[in-house]
Interface confidence: low
């Protein structure tokens, strides 16, 4: 089975999330400050002319970029696209923001700065007060809260109206922990790192975030090629060399939002064995209900068979037997020189009466600035609300 069951199409996860149509209530829109009540956060809805026509912060955003507009989506969403406008004011508004940054959070405590696939944080904004400028977020971000930080190159007034586009994140995956992806040296270097991981990287381990293994982009048969434009060889895959793991396996841990009964895990793997990539020989998963609890029961073990000689990339389905947990730890056994994964998703059901986890289970956030964002797939359920998704820009899958 080369397809990911339940795999969502990122191009369709582009529904307006409720600023303009007011399904996001005023109480879920806030700001660091407002110039006046008539430019309060609640007036920041795209295409709205309420109040004085936008949110305008009290302070200058130059030189310090500390003012922000915050939208609380209440549940985790994949945010694939944002739209911005300046101040309406009956057509008399002159204030807009030529650029801005985004920060986002899944738990309200740890905030991450959005970056594009090349590490650029600053997003081009508006050139006038009325035009709507849409920005495709590549990579998209999994967030409950999103903050817009308007920028200016001099002391000036800036005002903002916004919309967010995406879909609900139903899979419940909060983070995965994995060893840092490595570089394969062929005729050219193939960079198999998780380049959109938004957690922490410490001592060869990435934890507390999501990244390319949950971004909905399935890798190609030839791992040197990519679905994305203008990226480096190996971009779609995260890979590890057998030589670096004396244990003979790569271990990953997955944290979910609440207790779930897990039916299966789907891992999209490369099997270009002529270049050393092999499906895992087997997978072993352990389960626990809380971060400080013991692993429960026997691990689930699954040996992989099938046509291992077929060099095509494919999804491997690992049955998980309905085991109930909030944390999974899985070991992927090497069957060749390299393991290359492009996606990992889970088929699960929320256990009735289980409360969402409060924030992450990670320590006070370690150092370097959290990287860019993630995305996931059986995670996502489209929520049309009657409207059509915003069409993609031409060119790149994530513009």
């Amino acid at each position: 089975d080369a397809d990911m069951k339940g795999h969502f199409d990122p191009a369709k996860c582009r529904y307006a999330l409720g600023m303009q149509d007011r399904t996001i209530p005023d109480s879920d829109i806030s700001a660091s400050s407002s110039w006046s009540d008539s430019t309060a956060a609640r007036h920041s809805r795209l295409e709205s002319s309420d109040g004085d026509g936008a949110w305008c912060p009290a302070g200058s955003v130059f030189p310090k970029e500390e003012e922000y507009l915050q939208v609380d989506l209440q549940r985790l969403h994949l945010v694939a696209l944002v739209g911005t406008q300046g101040r309406h004011a009956g057509g008399l508004g002159k204030e807009f923001s030529r650029s801005y940054r985004l920060r986002y959070s899944r738990d309200g405590r740890r905030w991450m700065g959005w970056k594009d696939r090349w590490g650029q944080e600053v997003i081009s904004g508006n050139e006038d007060p009325e035009g709507v400028v849409l920005k495709d977020l590549g990579p998209p971000m999994v967030a409950r809260l999103v903050r817009f930080y308007p920028r200016a190159d001099r002391v000036m007034s800036v005002c903002l109206r916004v919309e967010l586009y995406g879909c609900l994140w139903r899979d419940g995956l909060l983070s995965y922990t994995a060893p840092v992806g490595q570089t394969m040296y062929l005729s050219e270097a193939v960079y198999l790192n998780d380049s959109t991981y938004d957690g922490h990287t410490v001592g060869g381990l990435q934890y507390g975030g999501l990244g390319q293994l949950a971004d909905g982009v399935v890798g190609l048969d030839d791992f040197r090629k990519s679905q994305e434009l203008r990226v480096w060889p190996g971009y779609d895959y995260v890979g590890w060399s057998n030589h670096s793991f004396s244990s003979g396996y790569v271990e990953m841990e997955f944290e979910f939002d609440r207790l779930r009964a897990f039916q299966a895990m789907q891992v999209h793997c490369n099997n270009m064995h002529t270049l050393g990539a092999r499906l895992p020989g087997g997978v072993e998963c352990r389960f626990r209900r809380g971060p400080a609890m013991a692993w429960e029961g026997e691990p689930m073990r699954h040996n992989l068979g099938g046509n291992l000689g077929d060099p095509r990339a494919r999804a491997v389905s690992v049955p998980l037997g309905g085991r109930v947990a909030r944390f999974l730890q899985c070991r992927f056994l090497f069957a060749g020189p390299w393991l290359l994964f492009s996606e990992i998703s889970f088929i699960s059901d929320v256990v009735n009466n289980s409360s969402p986890a409060l924030g992450g289970t990670f320590p006070p956030a370690p150092w370097w600035p959290p990287g860019p964002p993630p995305t996931n797939f059986s995670s996502l359920e489209l929520e049309p609300r009657g409207q059509q998704p915003v069409a993609k820009a031409e060119g790149s899958p994530t513009a």
């Epitope: 934890y207 990670f362 370690p366």
Partner: antibody, heavy 121, light 107 residues
Amino acid sequence: QVQLVESGGRVVQPGRSLRLSCTASGFSLNRYYMLWVRQAPGKGLEWIGTISYGDTTYYASWAKGRFTISRDNSKNTLYLQMNSLRAEDTAVYYCARADTGDNGYLGLQLWGQGTLVTVSS
Amino acid sequence: DIQMTQSPSSVSASVGDRVTITCRASQSIGSVLAWYQQKPGKAPKLLIYGVFSLQSGVPSRFSGSGSGTDFTLTISSLQPEDFATYYCQYIPYGSSPFGGGTKVEIK
């Protein structure tokens, strides 16, 4: 109050083993990265190793194989197991807590008072 | 492993002097650098983290600067209680090396 207290240091013969303890109070050890650092008499600080919140351990190259860091969450205690001790392991051994915040690493803000290990025949 | 080299290893100065201590990393380490002060028989005390940020309660005469591989701790006007040994430390957690230390002595 929030503190770290090391114990277990004593005079030990070369080739023997010793386990040092670092008991935390006022916070949970397993929410932080914890380090062991030592200081030989008249010398500088020397990093031994680190244990992450998830029990991943990292060691200085010279410490690998002879030194093992672990912890008992139920006792809120960090351990340093030292094997095949040598005279050059004579030092004051400190445990320290790595603090972090929204913008990154905030340094080793909390240290124990240290415990002296003397390796001598 | 990254090595941290401090210089000078010792410095003699008088009260009121400006003292500068440098720390050089064997490769670029970004901003994950801290400075500590240690007095004889005592545990180290954190002065500065993240290259520039002053730990709460530390006098403003201490300041940190630098980027990449070269970092500096400056004491703008040395006070009697500042005579001690100072260490830099890099914390990536794959390894966490300290510099060799700089002893600030009374001239």
